[in-house]
Interface confidence: low
């Protein structure tokens, strides 16, 4: 008698998460009598996935109806595909006995899920940075099968080439995760810059799923600092201004201090911003020079962002003021501009 | 913008049922799993389960098996919660909360929260 | 289930403090960990995921510590804006598991 052969003829299937996938198989002979059964992996540990006879397997159907006389398609389809269903199908035949005795097995059909990334999620650096610093970003997607995905950093449409990517497991698996690490040098012009993480795959039909973080979150621009001195006024008082510039963010908290002792504090707030997102603010302090027999070393102090202190010293020259004295001047600076380098 | 826009306050008596919707603006309901989570009074934050939006499948913590029903409808972008055979231990403002990742990997932790629905239960 | 121990269960601090809140998770949950804060009255809003990530658009004075079963939230400068209920969870593990949460009140 001919040989019995059970045919599978796919060798893989490939499906969408969600979808139906059909596993056909057929038999080229109604002899020996005994059932089908498909099971999922070979050997010992491999899983029963549907039984003819007994079991309940809510999921999975037959395609005909294999009740019929001579039916010899034993084709399933299996609903509602999850990534975990991904493995390899056997259709195997059985011999009638007690027990049934294994007779032959199909080639086995691979099934693959397609399973969409998750959307990019885009982290900053935990702690601000300066410019001409380099910060990372990381961007994580998760859940998609295959494994082939692409992704692409870009800062303001720009691709950026500082970048490492990671796609996990390295072997087979029901479906992978990727995380990938940019080095972003950042400039003084930042605050209003973004980073977008860029994620392609086949299950996205050519619609790249995106994630962004702003640098804004990522960069601190400490401030600049100028003292200058106007006039002096009939009162004998003199006007002193401290212009803080380009600082970003706002947070920033700014000290007078007479001869080292302290004579105001600001906060500063509600500070309009300049085009490049950065902020200005200006603070000035009168100080009645005929109080005075000796010079006056006034500072000018300057904390940003919780970051040490930046000072500009300079000392108003008590006995250089005449009651006509000129126009604007700037401060007499007996002091370095300490501005820290961060 | 994204959003999980919840229905209103409902107030019933025991035994009734109730269902809470919840609507995904600003992304794509199936792309993420969308939890529920129940607050009782004056206590902390309880896992209801989740629902797998692309599939369809739900999860249900211990608990809320048999009377709890999440459901889909991707047409109009919503997840519901249905209650039935309602108590007075039911009294709590329900939250839909949407999982930050896809299948499950970082899938636990929730970035965008419903602003909750008071279900009242009383005689 | 996994259980989820937060400490101090209740908090007075004053705006500009530097507030340090802690949970403990009664087994391994690697760094599957998630902060909300809840004001009442609302829901909560998501702060960190996976022990140390920060959402975008939360603000840098918060920040995430630890792994395994002890992590940590602090909140470098109190603003008033902060006081809240605080609460932790693992996703490490099914059922998804909250603490009862720490309450942060002004001083």
């Known amino acids: 008698e001919e040989e019995l052969q059970v045919i599978q003829p796919e060798k893989s299937v490939s499906v969408a998460a969600g979808d139906s996938a059909t596993l056909n198989c057929t038999v080229s002979s109604l002899i020996p009598v005994g059932p089908i059964q498909w099971f999922r992996g070979a050997g010992p540990g491999r899983e029963l996935i549907y039984n003819l006879k007994e079991g309940h397997f809510p999921r999975v159907t037959p395609v005909s109806d294999p009740t019929k006389r001579n039916n010899m398609d034993f084709s399933i389809r299996i609903s509602n595909i999850t990534p975990a269903d991904a493995g390899t199908y056997y259709c195997v035949k059985f011999r009638k006995g007690s027990p049934d005795v294994e007779l032959k097995s199909g080639a086995g059909t691979e099934l693959s899920v397609r399973a969409k990334p998750s959307a990019p999620v885009v982290s900053g650096p935990a702690v601000r940075a300066t410019a001409e610093h380099t910060v990372s970003f990381t961007c994580e997607s998760h859940g998609f099968s295959p494994r082939d995905i692409t992704l692409k950093w870009f800062k303001n449409g720009n691709e950026l080439s500082d970048v490492q990517t990671n796609v996990d497991p390295a072997g087979k698996s029901v479906s992978y995760s990727i995380r990938s690490t940019a080095r972003v040098v950042l400039t003084r012009r930042d605050v209003h810059s973004q980073v977008i993480c860029e994620v392609a795959h086949v299950t996205l039909q050519g619609d790249p799923l995106r994630g962004t973080a702003n640098l804004s979150e990522a960069i601190r621009v400490p401030p600049f600092l100028e003292v200058t001195q106007q006039s002096m006024r009939a009162d004998n008082q003199v006007n002193v201004t401290c212009q803080v510039t380009k600082f970003y963010p706002q947070r920033l908290q700014l000290t007078w201090l007479e001869n080292g002792n302290v004579s105001r504090t600001e906060m500063a707030s509600a500070l309009p911003e300049n085009k490049d997102g950065t902020y200005n603010w200006t603070s000035w302090l009168l100080v009645n020079v005929s109080a005075h027999r000796d010079d006056v070393k006034l500072t000018c102090q300057v904390e940003h962002d919780g970051q040490p202190a930046v000072n500009k010293s300079f000392s108003v020259k008590v006995s250089a003021h005449p009651k006509e004295q000129g126009s604007n001047t700037a401060a007499e600076n007996t002091g370095t501009n300490e501005r820290n380098i961060y | 913008q994204i959003q999980l826009v919840q229905s209103g306050s409902e107030l019933k008596k025991p035994g009734a049922s109730v269902k809470v919707s919840c609507r995904a603006r600003g992304y794509t309901l199936t792309d993420y799993a969308m939890n529920w989570v129940r607050q009782a009074p004056g206590q902390g934050l309880e896992w209801m389960g989740f629902?797998?939006?692309?599939?369809?499948?739900?999860t249900y913590a211990q608990g809320f098996k048999g009377r709890f029903v999440f459901s889909l409808d991707t047409s109009v972008s919503t997840a519901y919660l249905q209650i039935g055979s309602l108590k007075a231990e039911d009294t709590a403002v329900y939250y839909c909360?949407?999982?930050?990742?896809?299948?499950?990997?970082?899938?636990?932790?929730?970035?965008?929260w419903g602003q909750g629905t008071l279900v009242t239960v009383s005689s | 289930d996994i259980q989820m121990t937060q400490s101090p269960s209740s908090l007075s601090a004053s705006v500009g403090d530097r507030v340090t809140i802690t949970c403990r998770a009664s087994?391994?949950?690697?760094?599957?960990l998630a902060w909300y804060q809840q004001k009442p009255g609302k829901a909560p809003k998501s702060l960190i995921y996976s022990a140390i990530y920060r959402y975008i658009g939360v603000p840098s004075r918060f920040s995430g510590s630890g792994s395994g079963t002890d992590f940590t939230l602090t909140i470098s400068s109190l603003q008033p804006e902060d006081f809240a209920t605080y609460f932790c969870q693992q996703y490490n593990t099914y059922p998804l598991t909250f603490d009862q949460g720490t309450k942060l009140e002004i001083k």
């Open positions: 629902i797998n939006t692309y599939t369809g499948e739900p």
């Open positions: 909360a949407r999982t930050r990742g896809y299948y499950d990997f970082d899938g636990g932790a929730f970035d965008y």
């Open positions: 087994q391994n949950v690697g760094t599957h």
